[in-house]
Every structure is written in C-alpha cells, then in structure tokens.
C-alpha cells in the first residue's frame, strides 16, 4: 500500500513539475527591466527565451520573436536546449510511468517489469528536473554577469534636467517557476526510484527435498551416477557423490547446511 502511494505521489509531483517546466519555457518573463522614470509612459520591458515584449502603462503591449539565431548569445541557445531536453525527457518519463503504476493493470505485466519501468521513469524525471534547474540557473547567471545593470535616463521633472542612471535588470517570474518546477520533477523522480525498490519482488528461499525409494533402502542422489543399496562393495555406506541427498543412515532429524540451496 505504501509503495503504491509513494509511486502515485511521485507521478503526480512529477506531472506538476513537468507542467511547470513547460510553462516556464513558454513564459515571456524570464528577465524584466523597469523604466519608471520615463516622463512619457512607464515602460515595462520583459524577455523570454523566444520573444521580447514591451508593455506601456497605457496598456499597449508589443511582443517580437527572435527570428534570427545569429546575434543571440550562445548561452540563450544552451538554455533553450536544456529546457527542451528537460521537457522531452519528462514527457517520456510520464508516458513510461503511467504503464508502471501499480494501480493500473495492463495484461499480465509482472511486478519486476513494473519495477524496471518505475526506475526508468524515476531516472528520467531526475534528469529532466536537473536540466530545468540547470537551464534556469544558466540564464540567471547570464543576467547577473552581463545585463544586470543597464544605463537609462532619469528625468528630474517634466521640463527638468536629464541625468543618466542605472536601471536594474531583474529575474522574471519564469525563473522562479522553472526552479520550483525543476525541484518538483526531481523530487517526483526520487519518489519513483524509492517506489521501485518496494515493487521489486524479493528472492525466495526454497527448501531442498530428499526423495526416498520405497525398497531396499535406496536413496536417490541428485547429480550422482550410483545409488547405494547397502550391499556389495559399498557396504560401509561411503558417500559416492553428495549432491545434497544422503543415504538413509546419514539422514538425521537435525538440519545441516545441505538442507538449503
């Protein structure tokens, strides 16, 4: 029961996480820049992985896509790649984990197969989460190192003087969504891996059985080529080949190491 709960919870957490990674990747607010001191209109500039937008206080918003790969930083391309890899791995992981769920019966699928599928999806979720966290962190680092401060003008009055000031380029909402989503996917993956251990069937110890012939005190010796009859050359009941069975004289009520395989 605990295994099913762990697996189910892991699946749900990962599902939420991957939905968050997709949302973060599509969002425009990866970075934001505020220019509130503009005397014309307050301009809110925000950028995503795929397009850049400018919103004015009047409500007018203009968004333009990055139609060229040239001129875009390699880091931005790397972030795009990491996020896409994270989504693809997560999606495959979700597909695999659906069939691995203990509560879902698909034909005569054995628990060992479900355990393997659970582990596979768990690993995929972990890698997916790490990709998202890495992508978001790389973008955040790019912001801090390259574009954290940007020069802009500040107008001291409607007809006043103009002076140059620094405006901050801050983390957008998408970064936080990405971090949280990546973390959830990672946690979900770990839960799936834990559930896998509970799903795997444990090895059973089977007791060895001695088979006795009905006549002439003949003991069947597995693996041996002769059976002792108690007569003839082997009158002292010497062991000819001990494959786990014994002659009647040797059979005792107490257990020995040969009783277990």
């Amino acid at each position: 029961m605990a295994v099913t709960a762990c697996q189910g919870l892991g699946f749900v957490v990962s599902l939420i996480g991957i939905a968050g990674i997709i949302a973060a990747t599509c969002m425009d607010q990866w970075s934001t820049q505020d220019l509130y001191n503009n005397p014309v209109t307050a301009v809110f500039n925000y950028q995503g992985l795929w397009r850049s937008c400018v919103r004015e206080s009047s409500g007018f918003t203009e968004c333009r896509g990055y139609f060229t790969l040239l001129g875009l930083p390699a880091m931005l391309q790397a972030v795009r790649a990491l996020m896409i890899v994270g989504i693809v791995l997560g999606a495959i992981g979700l597909l695999v984990s659906i069939f691995a769920l203990k509560c879902i019966r698909i034909g005569s699928m054995e628990d060992s197969a479900k355990a393997n599928m659970t582990l596979t999806s768990g690993i995929m979720f972990i890698v997916s989460g790490l990709c998202a966290i890495a992508g978001v962190s790389v973008f955040a680092n790019m912001l801090v190192t390259n574009f954290w401060m940007s020069t802009a003008n500040m107008y001291t009055g409607m007809g006043g003087m103009v002076q140059t000031v620094q405006t901050r380029y801050t983390f957008g909402a998408a970064l936080f969504v990405g971090w949280v989503a990546g973390g959830l996917t990672l946690i979900g993956g770990v839960m799936m891996c834990i559930a896998c251990r509970g799903l795997a069937p444990e090895e059973t110890n089977y007791k060895a059985v001695s088979y006795h012939a009905s006549g002439h005190s003949v003991a069947y010796k597995p693996g041996g080529f002769k059976a002792s009859t108690g007569f003839g050359s082997n009158t002292k009941n010497k062991k000819i080949y001990d494959g786990g069975a014994r002659t009647e004289d040797e059979v005792q009520s107490y257990p020995s190491k040969h009783d277990y395989v």
Epitope: N38, V40, N45, S52, V54, E56, F60, N153
Partner: nanobody, 121 residues
Framework: QVQLVESGGGLVQPGGSLRLSCAAS????????MTWVRQAPGKGLEWVAG???????NYADSVKGRFTISRDNSKNTLYLQMNSLRAEDTAVYYC???????????????WGQGTLVTVSS
C-alpha cells in the same frame, strides 16, 4: 547598435515654424519610447517632448500648445513640429530613443548627434 540621425534644424524668426525629423537605423529590435531633448547654450539638458509606440505623448510645460510630437513606427522616424517659436527655444535638439538592438538586450538609451535650432530676428 541603433543609430539616430536628426535633421530639419536651422535659423528661423520668432513666431516661425520648423519641423525636425529623427530617423532610427541599425539593428533595431524595439523602440518603445522616443523623445526630444534640448540643450540651450551654456545650460543643461532639458526634456521637451516624448511619444511611446502605443501613441502616448507628453510635453514639457514650456512647449505645450506650441510643439507637436509624432512618429512613424513603420519607418522608425520621430518628428517634432515646432510652431510659434521664441528666442528661448534656441538650442541644440537631440533625439533620444529607449530601444533594444536585440530582443534579449535590455532597453538602452541611444542619442543622435543633435541639430541646431536658432530663433533670431
């Protein structure tokens, strides 16, 4: 980079009119706000008028009712129609644009080289 080139300045009599133009060129991604700023001889920079891409415009009190700002978004060009010019309007007029050369770049300020407007009889 974004380049701004002003034109239309010159000598005009008080009460006369003049039309300034500012053409933006280069690797322009977005120009949300364009403004005119002037610098009278021996004085600091003074903001005159500005217009956003959405059409919001604003004017300094000293030019309200006399100056009209407009822009052609398709040509990335800013205009300033100056009527009823006074001697105190004599200054070098600079075009200023808050623009980004690439989408992932923050909005930055770009300036023209300026055009001289002299109001004298």
């Amino acid at each position: 980079q974004v380049q701004l080139v002003e034109s239309g300045g010159g000598l005009v009599q008080p009460g006369g009119s003049l039309r300034l133009s500012c053409a933006a060129s280069g690797s322009i991604f977005s120009i949300p706000v364009m403004t005119w700023v002037r610098q009278a001889p021996g004085k600091g920079l003074e903001w005159v008028a500005g217009i956003s891409k959405g059409g919001t415009s604003n004017y300094a009190d000293s030019v309200k009712g006399r100056f009209t700002i407009s822009r052609d978004n398709s040509k990335n060009t800013l205009y300033l129609q100056m009527n009823s010019l006074r001697a105190e309007d004599t200054a070098v007029y600079y075009c200023n644009a808050q623009a980004s050369s690439f989408g992932w770049m923050p909005l930055s300020d770009y300036w023209g080289q300026g055009t001289l407007v002299t109001v004298s009889s």
